[in-house]
């Protein structure tokens, strides 16, 4: 009779994670007798799958009933494929003997690829918030991929954006993959609603790609313009001054008064109107009793938006004996270059 | 259903030969090494000879030389050919399987008595 | 050739009692051994293969332990059908060898 030869007819077997893998050995005699072991790797330092004759294998299956002496089908299943699996799998005959069975034929071995999900992309903009006409760089990351082929793509409000840098490791061979992204995006005051998109493909995905988004409301800080204006007297010593401020985000906004340097009261944004582009607007007045003040009376409105350094715009009120008009201030910020006096 | 059957056994005197024989039914006869065991009255077990799946044999020093082994696959029978018999091969003798993959046995016949006297 | 040795040679027990009955091999014999239990006037009946695998059909109060040279085996639970003579077997070279045997009798 021939010598036995172990035969592993698939040179590579692919199984997406989490799947079953079989992988197929048959030895062509029943003799010598002896135990089959399944291995991954060659050499000292290669791993035991499975023993036919001792051992706990949990993950591990035969295909046929391996306790028959006229087996020779030593195919294997392994459960729940991971890509911490992947590797060249050895069927090895061995004589049996003692005080140890003697290794005695393998097979050419079996490389297991495990096809691994990419997980979902996670995008991540700046700590801080920044201004429009700034460049802000947004980040993505994805782990445990296999193989190492992928794609990455970044999109702003549909647009395909190519300002970006994508790393893919390790560089080398791996059981699985990680990629990292970073994008650069220049901020309009329209962002409020825009989104930022890290788009993923990768063939476990069967053409449907994974997406991660970014609201550039979280990254966004549009600052507020400011306009004070004088409104019609409501009395005769009395003149109403508003403080529009417009188009600003995110809503954290306070609001001050001064009259000459001193402040008369301070308020928060809390009624605010929201803009088509999420900006928001508000309205601040201050009734100014004009008999109380002998000369004239600086208005300064001074507004602190989401922390940052105070903006102001002021108004100068003329204080004479006997008003007949009122008009608008409508001076650049901090300052009070056109006046009203009122008569 | 697996079964094994013995037969041929008697009385023989010392010197003379005997064949026994065993029908092996339910199981593919020829994927497996086949044995004897015998044992002697109020005693214990004694393994007496192996015929592998490619005919290769083996016996124990005390029956060498004088028991001989044998398949026939293609009827699904073991014989053991016994010469130069003595009082001392008195026994039953018991065909089995070699069924589990290491070769341990795992099928027994009824046995067949076997004596040696004059 | 390896030489067998069971102990005790016999042992009485009572019903439900545990038992160990012992077997020694005059060399290393890996785990190739295998168990067997016989009746009076009955053929051996295969009880385990490689020291601690259970024979197809065999209850699981019987199991079997060790390696090397020095293996057990273990009825858990003793019931009246258990009452018999068992054989220990070295399969790792030819000649197989059995031990003498251990007859297990009722107390």
């Known amino acids: 009779e021939e010598e036995l030869q172990v035969i592993q007819p698939d040179k590579s077997v692919l199984v997406a994670a989490g799947e079953t893998a079989t992988l197929r050995c048959t030895a062509t005699s029943l003799i010598p007798v002896g135990p089959i072991q399944w291995f991954r790797g060659a050499g000292p330092g290669r791993e035991l799958i499975y023993n036919q004759k001792e051992g706990h294998f949990p993950r591990v299956t035969t295909v046929s009933d391996l306790t028959k002496r006229n087996n020779m089908d030593f195919s294997i299943r392994i459960g729940n494929i991971t890509p911490a699996d992947a590797g060249t799998y050895y069927c090895v005959k061995f004589r049996k003997g003692s005080p140890d069975d003697v290794e005695f034929k393998s097979g050419a071995g079996t490389e297991l690829s495990v096809r691994a999900k990419p997980s979902a992309p996670v995008v991540s903009g700046p700590a801080a918030r920044a201004t429009p006409q700034h460049t802000v760089s947004f980040t993505c990351e994805s782990h445990g991929f296999s193989p190492r082929d992928i794609t990455l793509k970044w999109f702003k409000n549909g647009n395909e954006l190519s300002d970006f840098q994508t790393n893919v490791d390790p560089v080398g061979e791996s059981v699985s993959y990680s990629i990292h992204s970073t994008a650069k995006v220049v901020l309009t005051r329209e962002d409020v609603h825009s989104q930022v998109i890290c788009e993923v493909a990768h063939v476990t995905l069967q053409g449907d790609p994974l997406r991660g988004t970014a609201n550039l409301s979280e990254t966004i800080r549009v600052p507020p313009t400011l306009e004070v204006t004088q409104q019609p007297v409501r009395a005769e010593n009395q003149v109403n001054v508003t403080c529009q401020v417009r188009k600003f985000y995110p809503q954290r906004l306070q609001l001050t008064w001064l009259e000459n340097g001193n402040v008369s009261r301070t308020e928060t944004a809390s009624t605010v109107t929201e803009n088509k582009d999420g900006t928001y607007n508000w309205m601040s007045w201050l009734l100014v009793n004009v008999s109380a003040h002998r000369d004239d009376v600086k208005l300064t409105c001074q507004v602190e938006h989401d922390g940052q350094p105070a903006v102001s715009k002021s108004h100068d009120l003329k204080v004479s004996a006997h008003p007949k008009e009122q008009g608008s201030n409508t001076a650049a910020e901090n300052t009070g270059s056109n006046e009203r006096n009122i008569y | 259903e697996v079964q094994l059957v013995e037969s041929g056994g008697g009385l023989v005197q010392p010197g003379g030969s005997l064949r026994l024989s065993c029908a092996a039914s339910?199981?593919?006869?020829?994927?497996?090494?086949m044995h004897w065991v015998r044992q002697a009255t109020g005693k214990g077990l004694e393994w007496v000879s192996v015929?592998?799946?490619?005919?290769?044999?083996y016996y124990p020093g005390s029956v060498k030389g004088r028991f001989t082994i044998s398949r026939e696959n293609a009827k699904n029978s073991l014989h053991l050919q016994m010469n130069s018999l003595r009082a001392g091969d008195t026994a039953v003798y018991y065909c089995?399987?070699?069924?589990?993959?290491?070769?341990?046995?795992?099928?027994w016949g009824q046995g067949t008595m076997v004596t040696v006297s004059s | 050739d390896i030489q067998m040795t069971q102990s005790p040679s016999s042992l009485s027990a009572s019903v439900g009692d545990r038992v160990t009955i012992t077997c020694r091999a005059s060399?290393?014999?890996?785990?190739?051994l295998a168990w067997f239990q016989q009746k009076p006037g009955k053929a051996p009946k295969s009880l385990i293969y490689t020291t601690s695998s259970l024979q197809s059909g065999v209850p699981s109060k019987f199991s079997g332990s060790g390696s090397g040279t020095d293996f057990t085996l273990t009825i858990s639970s003793l019931q009246p059908e258990d009452f018999a003579t068992y054989y220990c077997?070295?399969?790792?070279?030819?000649?197989?060898?059995f031990g003498q045997g251990t007859k297990l009798e009722i107390k």
């Open positions: 339910g199981f593919t006869f020829s994927s497996y090494d």
């Open positions: 089995a399987r070699g069924g589990n993959w290491d070769d341990a046995l795992d099928i």
């Open positions: 077997q070295q399969y790792v070279s030819y000649p197989y060898t």
């Open positions: 060399q290393d014999i890996n785990n190739y």
């Open positions: 015929i592998g799946i490619s005919g290769d044999t």
